[in-house]
């Protein structure tokens, strides 16, 4: 939602988290803001304090409930308003009403883990984080591998397009340094977007046995 | 209803202090804010700042600061304002006027009757 | 202090003819919400105040649709297409975008 110079853009992490991020040039420094949310069909409403993450920039986390409980539904819409504090009131900043899924962005992926290395290939695992029972198996992933020499940017995309948390990378060279790292998207909502990166796993290929080709 | 009922005129000598009074009703006093705007005889309006019952946050116009205080009693939904080193330049009538807590639309949506506050030697 | 000025001081209007008063201010008073909190207030002989206009141009609840408020950025005005024997008094513009917040002088309308 943008009102003249501000942008407020928030997301559900599927189960009891709504990420906020409001910018605004010119926004005063000193000012206290807050981001309030109030469901249509519930009976709790929640507020988190603005923090600054830049120079015109700030962020909180709605918290809902405990990580894993499911806060919200497809037919929920909830009214999220940025106020800031003016003298002793609270002024509307921006505001939107926020379908949740519609608006999606999972956690990262946890617990990547080693299941199998070897000179040429690794089979790596993972899980996702306070992922809603709704999407079922409708989930895709991305992954990237950084190689010696390489940024992330650089890394190919490997997409695996249905809820597969585990991948075998091929083709790598023999002992050597290598790290992974996945993210996940619901295939469901608008506006959603990829989860952040995952934790880098960092793996090591084993070397090529002596006096053998590689 | 709401209504917003201040007290009597006050007359008051030079250097001395008044407080003048208003009781809410017709509301639950503590989600909205009371503000304080004062008009000198045949002059125009000037608000002085206001708090909010809720939590007793005050924010005086700078104009005021040091000379103003702002309170509330909230067992008998009444709000006070209290002008202290008075002079003849503060002869005014004094209004409380109902503030929403999160400005969205209007400043003041209902005023008290005023209080006529004169400072004579 | 953003400074609200008015004018005419002084509004002599015959009654069932159309009305108008200006209200300049001194900067721009559209809120950095992208809202421009310029609110109208009557104030009837020996009344209160009384709020007829808000956000420029929306009447207050119970309003008659007779006074309606335009306008943007600095300059704004009150119209009463039709004045009425109870439209007699004194009319302020207030603005409610930077603190601290700030009435106009007032124009006195009366009936020729």
């Known amino acids: 939602a943008v009102n003249g110079t501000s942008q407020f853009t928030c997301f559900y992490n599927s189960r009891a988290n709504i990420s906020c991020v409001w910018s605004q040039d010119g926004a005063l420094q000193d000012t206290s803001c807050q981001v309030h949310a109030w469901p249509d069909r519930r009976r709790w409403n929640q507020t988190c304090e603005l923090l600054p993450v830049s120079q015109a920039s700030w962020a909180c986390n709605l918290i809902l409930g405990a990580p894993d409980s499911q806060k919200l539904t497809t037919v929920d819409i909830v009214t999220l308003r940025v106020l800031c504090r003016e003298g002793v009131r609270w002024r509307v900043m921006a505001i939107q009403d926020f379908k949740p899924f519609e608006n999606l962005r999972l956690m990262a992926p946890i617990s990547l883990q080693v299941v199998h290395v070897e000179t040429h290939r690794c089979n790596i695992s993972w899980e996702i984080s306070q992922a809603s029972h709704y999407f079922e198996r409708h989930l895709e992933f991305e992954a990237r591998t950084l190689s010696p020499g390489h940024t992330w940017e650089e890394a190919p995309l490997l997409t695996l397009k249905q809820k597969q948390e585990w991948i075998c990378l091929e083709t790598l060279t023999p002992d050597t340094q290598y790290e992974f790292q996945v993210r996940v998207k619901p295939l469901q909502g608008e506006f959603t977007t990829w989860s952040p990166w995952s934790q880098p796993l960092a793996f090591r290929t084993k070397p090529a046995a002596l006096g053998k080709d590689t | 209803e709401v209504q917003l009922v201040q007290s009597g005129a006050e007359v008051k000598k030079p250097g001395a202090s008044v407080k003048v009074s208003c009781k809410a009703s017709?509301?639950?006093?503590?989600?909205?804010?009371i503000s304080w705007v004062r008009q000198a005889t045949g002059q125009g309006l000037e608000w002085m700042g206001e708090i909010y019952p809720g939590d007793a946050q005050t924010y005086y116009n700078e104009m005021f600061k040091g000379r103003v205080t702002m309170t509330r009693d909230t067992s008998i939904s009444t709000a006070y304002m209290e002008l202290s080193s008075l002079r003849s330049e503060d002869t005014a009538v004094y209004y409380c006027?109902?503030?929403?807590?999160?400005?969205?639309?209007?400043?003041?949506?209902?005023w008290g009757q005023g209080t006529t506050v004169t400072v004579s030697s | 202090d953003v400074v609200m000025t008015q004018s005419p001081l002084s509004l002599p209007v015959t009654l069932g003819q159309p009305a108008s008063i200006s209200c300049r201010s001194s900067?721009?008073?559209?809120?950095?919400?992208?809202?421009?909190?310029l609110e109208w207030f009557q104030q009837r002989p020996g009344q209160s105040p009384r709020l007829l206009i808000y956000k420029v141009s929306n009447r207050f609840s119970g309003v008659p649709d007779r006074f309606s408020g335009s306008g943007s950025g600095t300059d704004f005005t009150l119209k009463i297409s039709r004045v009425e024997a109870e439209d007699v008094g004194v009319y302020y513009c207030f603005q409610g975008s930077h603190i601290p917040w700030t009435f106009g002088g007032g124009t006195k309308v009366e009936i020729k």
């Open positions: 006027a109902r503030g929403s807590y999160t400005y969205d639309n209007y400043a003041m949506d209902f």
């Open positions: 017709g509301y639950t006093f503590t989600d909205y804010v």
């Open positions: 900067q721009n008073i559209v809120h950095s919400n992208a809202n421009t909190y």
